[in-house]
Amino acid sequence: SPTPFGPEGQLEDELHKPKAIQTEVKPSVRFNLRTSKDPEHEGCYLSLGHSQPLEDCGFNMTAKTFFIIHGWTMSGIFENWLHKLVSALHTREKDANVVVVDWLPLAHQLYTDAVNNTRVVGHSIARMLDWLQEKDDFSLENVHLIGYSLGAHVAGYAGNFVKGTVGRITGLDPAGPMFEGADIHKRLSPDDADFVDVLHTYTRSFGLSIGIQMPVGHIDIYPNGGDFQPGCGLNDVLGSMAYGTITEVVKCEHERAVHLFVDSLVNQDKPSFAFQCTDSNRFKKGICLSCRKNRCNSIGYNAKKMRNKRNSKMYLKTRAGMPFRVYHYQMKIHVFSYKNMGEIEPTFYVTLYGTNADSQTLPLEIVERIEQNATNTFLVYTEEDLGDLLKIQLTWEGASQSWYNLWKELRSYLSQPHNPGRELNIRRIRVKSGETQRKLTFCAEDPENTSISPGRELWFRKCRDGWRMKNETSPTVELP
C-alpha cells in the first residue's frame, strides 16, 4: 500500500530529503496549452504566476477550459489517444482552451510510486486553477477536467484541493489497483466537482481489475457491462496487429473509455445512450431500458448533468469501433407450454425487419433460464437504425451446432425421454426501443399457429402501437 501521507511524505522526510540542485531542472508537472489540432505543434507552456504566456498564446478567459490528464505510463511519452482527444475537443469546442497536464516524469515510475505521486500532481493543478481564478472573467464553472486511468484520480485530487468547485470531471476508466475501496478523499469521488461522470471499460471481478469497479461519480457508466469490450478480444487484437498480446487486449479495453469519449465529441449526431440499472445482469435481461425520471442519459461529453442523492450506475451496449452507437430493444415474450417439458433451454434467434433496414440474425441471450407460462424479457441490440419495426422472425435453433447445444439436447432428452415433441407457444412479442422509448406489440402472423419447436420459426407482425391489447384488463407494469 502507498506510504501513509502520500507523495509529500511526513514533514521530517520533507525536511531531511536533500533537495535536487535547482539548475535548469524541468518541473515535474507542466501545463501545455494546445493551440492547434496538430500533435506536432508544441503549443505553449503555462507557468504559475506568469501572465505573459496566457496573453501570447491566446488563452480565452471566458471560454471553456479542458485539462487532459494522462495516467501511468510505461513508455514515458504521450500516447496516441491523447492527440486524438485534443483534436476532438478542438473540433467540438472551437474557442475552448485545451490544456494537457504533462506529469510524465512522475507517471513513468513503478505503478505504486506513480500512485503516490497523484496527490502532488492534483495539488499542482489546483494551484494553477487557483491562480487562474484570480484573473478577471475566469470561472471554475467552465473548467472540465478529463482524466484517464490514474489521471482520473489526479483530477479528483485537483477538484478536492482547488479553492471552490470545478464544473465537471470526467473519469475515463479510473485506475483500480490501490483505489478500490479507498477513502472518499483518496480517489475520484462525487464531491470533487459539480458534476462527475465516469466511464468504466476494464473492470474485472476475478483477477486484477485495471479499472475501478466501484462507482465513483454522480453517474457511472459501464459500457458492455464494464468488462469485455467488443473488438478487444485476443482474436480481434491478433488480427489487427502483427504481434497481439494480452497487454494489447488490456490496453484496448482500458483505453476504450477514451475512444467512447472521443466518439461523443466527434459523432454528435450519433449519441450513445446508457440506461440506469442496479447491475449488469439485470441490464442483460433487458429489464432496464427506461428513460423515466432521468433513468437514461447520453454518454461522454454529451452527458446531462445529474446530481442524484445516490450514485447512478448505467449500462449500454456498443459496437466494436467508432461510431459506437447501437440501438437497444427490450423484448418481452410470453412463453406458453401446453406440455410438461421439464427444464428446457431453447436457443432463440430473432431477425428484426424495419422501414430503414433489417437486422442480422440476433441471439436472444438467456441470462438465467426460460420461464414457462411466464413473460421472459430479453435485450437485443442492432448496429444499424432499422427505422420503425414492421415484423419479427423468431427462430428456435435446430440441429445442434455446437458441443454445448448437443449437451443441452442430450440433457433435455435424458430428463424427458418420452417427450419427443418439444414445443412452445408464443402468441405475441412486445418490443420497446431504448432510444425512442416507443412500445410496440407484434402478434403471430398466423393466430392459429403459435407453436415453435427446434429448427422451426415463427413470424410476428406489428399489430399495435403500445403494449396494451384490447382484451387485456391488467395494466402493464412500468419497468424500473
Epitope: 500500500s1 501513509p4 501521507f5 502520500g6 509529500e8 511526513q10 514533514l11 521530517e12 520533507e14 496527490r119 495539488h123 489546483a126 478536492n160 484541493f161 482547488v162 479553492k163 471552490g164 478500490e180 475501496g181 479507498a182 477513502d183 472518499i184 478523499h185 483518496k186 469521488s189 462525487p190 464531491d191 469497479q213 466501484m214 445516490r310
Partner: antibody, heavy 116, light 107 residues
Framework: QVQLQQSGAELMKPGASVKISCKAT????????IAWVKQRPGHGLEWIGE????????KYNKKFKGKATFTADTSSNTAYMQLSSLTSEDSAVYYC?????????WGQGTSVTVSS | DIVMTQSHKFMSTSVGDRVSITCKAS??????VAWYQQKPGQSPKLLIY???YRFTGVPDRFTGSGAGTEFTFTINSVQAEDLAVYYC?????????FGGGTKLEIK
C-alpha cells in the same frame, strides 16, 4: 511523526459557545482533511464533519449544521471547531483526526462539559 | 445516510482464541470500510482500511474482509491487550458513518 495536539478540557454554561483547537505537526497540514468526531460517555463515535485547511472547504453532518463551525489557520497548522448554543447534549469528548487512508491519526480528545 | 450496524454490542473471548466482529451497511459501500480500536481512556486507532488492508504498524493477527454490505473484522489469536471497543466506519460517501461499536471482553 504525525501528531495532533488538542486544547484542554472545558466546563461551559448552557447557551455559551466554545472553541476547541487541534494543532497538527509531522505532515503537510494544508492538504489533508481534518475531521471532528463526538463521543458521549458510554456512546459510540459520531462524525461531525471535516475541513481541508488549504482551501477552507468543509463538509458537515447535517445533524451538526448550525451547531459546529470549522476553521483552520495554515500559518500555525491549527484547526478549530466552535460549538454554539451549548446544551447538556453537547457534553462529550471531541476528537480531531486527520484523514488519509481512514482517520489515520487522532488527537487525544477534548472534554466539554455543559453544566449550569 | 448509510447506516452501519454492528449487531453485537459485547463479545467475550479468551486469550489465544479467534474472534470475529461483523458489520452490516444499509447499502452497498463496496470495500470502503475501515475498522478502529479504542482502548479504555484512549483515542481510537485505525487498524484496517479499504475493508482488508492493515494500516502501518498493525499486527498481522488483525484482519478484515468483506465487500458490498457485509464486513468482518477478525483477531486471529486474541491477546490481553486487545481488550477494547472496535468500530467499523464506511468511507465510501459523506456523511461518514460509524457502527455502534463492539466491546471485546477477555474472560
Amino acid at each position: 511523526q504525525v501528531q495532533l495536539q488538542q486544547s484542554g478540557a472545558e466546563l461551559m454554561k448552557p447557551g455559551a459557545s466554545v472553541k476547541i483547537s487541534c494543532k497538527a505537526t509531522g505532515y503537510t497540514f494544508s492538504t489533508y482533511w481534518i475531521a471532528w468526531v463526538k463521543q458521549r460517555p458510554g456512546h459510540g463515535l459520531e462524525w461531525i464533519g471535516e475541513i481541508l485547511p488549504g482551501s477552507a472547504k468543509t463538509k458537515y453532518n447535517k445533524k451538526f449544521k448550525g451547531k459546529a463551525t470549522f476553521t483552520a489557520d495554515t500559518s500555525s497548522n491549527t484547526a478549530y471547531m466552535q460549538l454554539s448554543s451549548l446544551t447538556s447534549e453537547d457534553s462529550a469528548v471531541y476528537y480531531c483526526a486527520v484523514y488519509d487512508y481512514g482517520a489515520d491519526y487522532w488527537g487525544q480528545g477534548t472534554s466539554v462539559t455543559v453544566s449550569s | 445516510d448509510i447506516v452501519m450496524t454492528q449487531s453485537h454490542k459485547f463479545m467475550s473471548t479468551s486469550v489465544g482464541d479467534r474472534v470475529s466482529i461483523t458489520c452490516k451497511a444499509s447499502q452497498d459501500v463496496y470495500t470502503a470500510v475501515a475498522w478502529y480500536q479504542q482502548k479504555p481512556g484512549q483515542s481510537p486507532k485505525l487498524l484496517i482500511y479499504s475493508a482488508s488492508y492493515r494500516f502501518t504498524g498493525v499486527p498481522d493477527r488483525f484482519t478484515g474482509s468483506g465487500a458490498g454490505t457485509e464486513f468482518t473484522f477478525t483477531i486471529n489469536s486474541v491477546q490481553a491487550e486487545d481488550l477494547a471497543v472496535y468500530y467499523c466506519q464506511q468511507h465510501y460517501s459523506i456523511p461518514r458513518t460509524f457502527g455502534g461499536g463492539t466491546k471485546l471482553e477477555i474472560k
